[in-house]
């Protein structure tokens, strides 16, 4: 590919060094921190941006599940092994041996164990609730604008195609966006739902992975959508194994 | 042209540094990966790291991490490769490289020999 | 980290003949984002550096001769010399660049039967 060939960036990643090193001197634009050469006319992997982002401060999470297999990201950042695709291997483990199972989205999906640990396969999220509180405003944002807004920009910014985007449920002050995408739905060329979702959290919190794009600027007919809270829910095709104790806690 | 030059023979006591430089020209020094790679006597290539000078950024082989320090002074367009800790299994030559799909340009090595 | 394995580790073969050399990994190495494999081919002679002869798995550096070919996809990769010559003798790595750390075979060694 040639990434904007005049002066060699990656419009979609910023988290990249480009060099006119590829096949006949062409721009070529390779992730930091797994040196993998990157699509720059569309997402990086979520695994290679959190490769990337590894000295980034821990983010912990901690808040209700909306359904008792969802998951919610509360380990934060790590530094995770991704597969010559870019994505996820299904089994991660930190400097000290310590082992886990993590979903195509790379969130823990089993207890810690060592390195005895077997993840047989990389269990796909097919489900991605994105559940955001937005700041007062004058009045509620009307649901069918608000819905056509949030299609759109993941339509257009995202790259995901609006198929995925099952639903928008709108109760002030409360936004949930529904993402669905099966194995078998998901085409060669489609943006997958959960760099689509990763992609919006980093938006959200004023830490865009575009290149020298200004950061998100949600309006609805004009009006700001000021985001305060997000928190994501992640479903998997088959459900996470964790201990009874993990459960009850 | 594209030229590497690196600097001469080295020959160093157990626990001490080395510090290799390896000099670009016919290029801009600034926008390519440029790569070291060790060659033991006999033996096949390891890479060792690689620095882009026009961001500092510097990846290392974990097998080299905390011995190896790669540099570059972007005003004489030289790249450098530190070793320190050097015990004898680091008698090698050393090479630089710019890297890329079709950067087919290597330094001439630095022989560097650890002994007591 | 992949691994890179090269068979046969030497190769001895008459001036003329085809040579093939084969390099495996232990991952895939094609890039689905641009369909490209990174997987390069050196050669290099005693007392020297390493000489770029193939890239991207099968496309020659310029100035190599043509009897030099790459071929493979994924995880095999293959390079053939059409017509040995004498000053082919040389040993041959090939080179993953995919993904840090980028790692080589261990090479074949060339010589002539």
């Known amino acids: 590919h040639t990434a904007a060939q005049d002066n060699c960036t990656c419009p979609t990643n910023k988290m990249t060094v480009c060099s006119p090193d590829g096949p006949g001197g062409r721009c070529q634009c390779r992730a930091l921190g797994s040196g993998m050469a990157v699509d720059c006319s569309t997402l990086t992997s979520k695994c290679l941006l959190l490769k990337a982002r590894m000295s980034a401060p821990k983010n912990a999470r901690t808040l209700v599940r909306p359904s008792e297999h969802a998951l919610v990201d509360n380990d934060g950042l790590y530094d995770p092994d991704c597969d010559p695709e870019g994505r996820f291997k299904a089994r991660q483990c930190n400097q000290t041996s310590v082992c886990w199972c993590v979903n195509s989205v790379g969130v823990r999906r089993t207890d810690k164990g060592d390195l005895s640990l077997r993840c047989d396969e990389l269990v796909r999220t097919h489900h991605i609730l994105i559940d955001l509180r937005h700041r007062p405003t004058a009045g509620a944002f009307n649901h069918s604008d608000l819905d056509a807004e949030l299609r759109r920009l993941f339509r257009e910014r995202y790259r995901l195609h609006p198929k995925f985007v099952a639903a928008v449920h709108y109760e002030q002050p409360t936004i949930q966006i529904e993402l669905r995408q099966n194995t078998s739905q998901k085409a060669a060329g489609d943006v997958d739902i959960g760099d689509a979702a990763y992609y919006f959290e980093r938006d959200i919190k004023g830490e865009s992975l575009f290149q020298g794009r200004g950061g998100l600027d949600l309006r609805v007919r004009g009006e700001p959508l000021q985001v305060e809270r997000t928190l994501i829910y992640y479903l998997d095709e088959i459900p996470p194994k964790f201990s009874m104790k993990r459960l009850t806690a | 042209q594209v030229q590497l030059v690196q600097s001469g023979p080295e020959v160093k006591k157990p626990g001490a540094s080395v510090k290799v430089s390896c000099k670009a020209s016919g290029y801009t020094f600034t926008i390519y990966w440029l790569g070291w790679v060790k060659q033991a006597p006999g033996q096949g290539l390891e890479w060792i790291g690689n620095i882009f000078p026009g961001s500092a950024y510097i990846n290392y082989n974990e097998k080299f991490k905390g011995r190896v320090t790669i540099t570059a002074d972007t005003s004489t367009s030289t790249a450098y490769m530190e070793l320190s800790s050097l015990r004898s299994e680091d008698t090698a030559v050393y090479f630089c490289?710019?890297?890329?799909?079709?950067?087919?340009?290597w330094g001439q090595g630095t022989l560097v020999t650890v002994s007591s | 980290d992949i691994v890179m394995t090269q068979s046969p580790d030497s190769l001895a073969v008459s001036l003329g003949e085809r040579a093939t050399i084969n390099c495996k990994s232990s991952q895939s190495l094609l890039n689905s984002g641009n369909q490209q494999n990174y997987l390069a081919w050196y050669q290099q002679k005693p007392g020297q550096p390493p000489k770029l002869l193939i890239y991207?798995?099968?496309t020659r550096e310029s100035g190599v001769p043509d009897r030099f070919s790459g071929s493979g996809s994924g995880t095999d990769f293959t390079l053939t010399i059409s017509s040995l010559q004498a000053e082919d003798v040389a040993v041959y790595y090939c080179q993953s660049d995919h993904i840090y750390p980028y790692t080589f075979g261990q090479g074949t060694k060339l010589e002539i039967k």
């Open positions: 991207g798995a099968s």
């Open positions: 490289a710019r890297e890329g799909s079709n950067s087919g340009y």
